[in-house]
């Protein structure tokens, strides 16, 4: 008995393969600065990079600004949104701004979207400073099903900071659903 | 045939060991209050605790304020930075403050550094309040290679809150690179 | 030798089972709007949902607002706290508000509690705006032992936003302790 029996060899590899988990889904998506909507109303951000700079995606799909889940699981979701304004860009849309982010889940099973996370602040940017800046970060752990889509809505999209380190969102799968 | 053949025993344990993943790299580093730079300019924070209170590190290395990656992988990085000022400490550096954090990646191979994440806010702390406080949180999922280093830069370091629950950064490996 | 020897069968399954990690502990707890304390002092939030909407819990226990760890491990902890005020609700508790969150660890063995994370901001909400809003997010990686409990303290609880996407905290186990 000098080796692994033929019958067992497959199982061996199977178990070993199972021991090394397959690559889990993830995404880190950065804002596409060339395609930020104007205005001060609340909008869905529909243009994100997935393959340049820090942006990356695996076992998830990006389409029309929505991050689509391909694999059931528990995911950690996060978003970082930066707003900025320099007086050289003209005046801000209003003295009192609501700078907000909503991380939203949509699905063919649900006719409206559902806010998973929100964050933000009201700001008075009418002051004497020539530059204004504000960032929001949200994160949370959610059960997501294949076919569900995650998107990001913001108020005052014209004030978004277009840098890849400033405005991004992402997800990574932490574990399976039982 | 009453036991596991000697030849197989190693493989058995190997597979079993592989089944139980080895401890993944992580770090949670808290600010060293004794060594916070003064001034209002942007600086790299070069002194962090790694082994007292909540601070800890495993399979990563801390050197001169930089958190060095020893193992390729996808990591979740985060930072929490608190700024505070009490009127008993004298006046703030300026009426309009930019309270900012930058989480930065550098590599021995490439001398330049790259901002992975940023956050913050402009603040007017010249008001009638005797105490001012503001916190920033950022987090994101990044591919890091062995030898790359993560550091934290802030503006107005003299305003940093030195508590371990206030000013910290960290990382934990989520998964391997393919 | 046409199959797996009886003696080995258990080991086979064991290894295979070990290959598929058991469900790790996690919780995502959302504020119970019906039970938010009044006042402007600092309080522990003692009423959270664990089983409706986005709220969920597994292999952890919620009791009297405290999230109890049942399994030693390294956990990522997070909290998102939103404060808001509309002028129709009357005036704010003070011109200058400290809007703060503290994520706290207590242990049955040690009666004292320890702040793991804090965040927040001082705010002047006495301005001309009819609506005010502000959110805080904190997160970090901590070693937790079975029997330890995590809770959330906030200042100005009467200003909390009661939406499930606004005010929540959570945890998920990332890895074992060696």
């Amino acid at each position: 008995f000098s080796g692994v029996p033929a019958m067992m060899e497959g199982s061996w590899l199977d178990v070993a393969r199972r021991g090394k988990p397959e690559a889990q889904p993830f995404a880190h998506l950065t804002i596409n600065a060339a395609d930020i909507p104007s205005g001060s109303h609340k909008v869905s951000l529909s243009s994100w990079y997935h393959d340049r700079g820090w942006a990356k995606i695996s076992n998830m799909t990006l389409s029309n600004g929505k991050l689509r889940v391909n694999q059931d699981g528990f995911y950690y979701l996060y978003a970082n949104i930066c707003f900025r304004h320099h007086e050289t860009s003209g005046s801000v849309p209003a003295d009192y701004l609501q700078l907000m982010v909503y991380v939203v889940k949509t699905s063919i099973k649900i006719p409206s979207s559902h806010n998973l996370m929100k964050g933000g602040s009201t700001k008075n940017w009418s002051g004497n400073s020539e530059f204004h800046f504000y960032s929001i970060n949200v994160g949370g752990f959610f059960k997501l099903r294949a076919g569900e889509e995650i998107s990001v809505q913001v108020s005052n999209p014209s004030l978004l900071d277009p840098d890849q380190d400033a405005t991004y969102f992402g997800a990574f799968k932490v574990q399976d659903i039982d | 045939f009453s036991g596991v053949p000697a030849m197989m025993e190693g493989s058995w344990l190997d597979v079993a060991r592989r089944g139980k993943p080895e401890a993944q790299p992580f770090a949670h580093l808290t600010i060293n209050a004794a060594d916070i730079p003064s001034g209002s300019h942007k600086v790299s924070l070069s002194s962090w605790y790694h082994d007292r209170g909540w601070a800890k590190i495993s399979n990563m290395t801390l050197s001169n304020g930089k958190l060095r990656v020893n193992q390729d992988g996808f990591y979740y990085l985060y930072a929490n930075i608190c700024f505070r000022h009490h009127e008993t400490s004298g006046s703030v550096p300026a009426d309009y403050l930019q309270l900012m954090v930058y989480v930065v990646k550098t590599s021995i191979k490439i001398p330049s550094s790259h901002n992975l994440m940023k956050g913050g806010s402009t603040k007017n702390w010249s008001g009638n309040s005797e105490f001012h406080f503001y916190s920033i949180n950022v987090g994101g999922f990044f591919k890091l290679r062995a030898g790359e280093e993560i550091s934290v830069q802030v503006s107005n370091p003299s305003l940093l809150d030195p508590d371990q629950d206030a000013t910290y950064f960290g990382a934990f490996k989520v998964q391997d690179i393919d | 030798f046409s199959g797996v020897p009886a003696m080995m069968e258990g080991s086979w399954l064991d290894v295979a089972r070990r290959g598929k990690p058991e469900a790790q502990p996690f919780a995502h707890l959302t504020i119970n709007a019906a039970d938010i304390p009044s006042g402007s002092h600092k309080v522990s939030l003692s009423s959270w949902y664990h089983d409706r909407g986005w709220a969920k819990i597994s292999n952890m226990t919620l009791s009297n607002g405290k999230l109890r760890v049942n399994q030693d491990g390294f956990y990522y902890l997070y909290a998102n706290i939103c404060f808001r005020h509309h002028e129709t609700s009357g005036s704010v508790p003070a011109d200058y508000l400290q809007l703060m969150v503290y994520v706290v660890k207590t242990s049955i063995k040690i009666p004292s509690s320890h702040n793991l994370m804090k965040g927040g901001s001082t705010k002047n909400w006495s301005g001309n705006s009819e609506f005010h809003f502000y959110s805080i997010n904190v997160g970090g990686f901590f070693k937790l032992r079975a029997g330890e409990e995590i809770s959330v303290q906030v200042s100005n609880p009467s200003l909390l936003d009661p939406d499930q996407d606004a005010t929540y905290f959570g945890a998920f186990k990332v890895q074992d302790i060696d």
Epitope: K42, S44, S46, N64, V104, I108, K109, P111, S112 | - | -
Partner: antibody, heavy 121, light 107 residues
Amino acid sequence: QVQLVQSGAEVKKPGSSVKVSCKASGYAFTNYYIEWVRQAPGQGLEWMGVINPGWGDTNYNEKFKGRVTITADKSTSTAYMELSSLRSEDTAVYYCARRDTAHGYYALDPWGQGTTVTVSS
Amino acid sequence: DIQMTQSPSSLSASVGDRVTITCKASQNVGTNVAWYQQKPGKAPKLLIYSASYRYSGVPSRFSGSGSGTDFTLTISSLQPEDFATYYCQQYWDYPLTFGGGTKVEIK
């Protein structure tokens, strides 16, 4: 401008099938869901089903399950609704409508002009 | 399924009148309610979304209110072109459901 144009009126025999088309223009077809709603003569509005044209995901009203099939052709920006085993009570005007998910209001706008389907022996 | 009960089913009014139509949901639907106007032989047109937001191009005389289970569409001063049938619709959950309609006729 944003428009949904439906195929023309149909007269069908009981037991047969009908396939109504809805051609979208003026917007990115895959960005928005297409819902199908019908209205029997002198009656109210009844939802039949929905498709995500980007992926082909569908969701149907239980009442029509097994009889209705909604599809989409991205290349022509056209959605289709097929209803089989027709009976006289299926006589109605069939509408397609776009569900706006981009602005966070999820109501139906615009609607197609409607396709009258008459089921008669 | 969520029932949307609309009342009245019809009403007669004159130009300049203030008209109120109500809709009651059988369960909490938040503010996920829309109102549509439909004229004979035409497709419905969106007037109000999210219970109280007027759709672009809709005259300011149309307003919506309510949340949870009780919703109202108000026409502050009825105009000749407003004689039509009005439907409420919930989009809290599938299947989408509509009220039975309110026909606004000339007195």
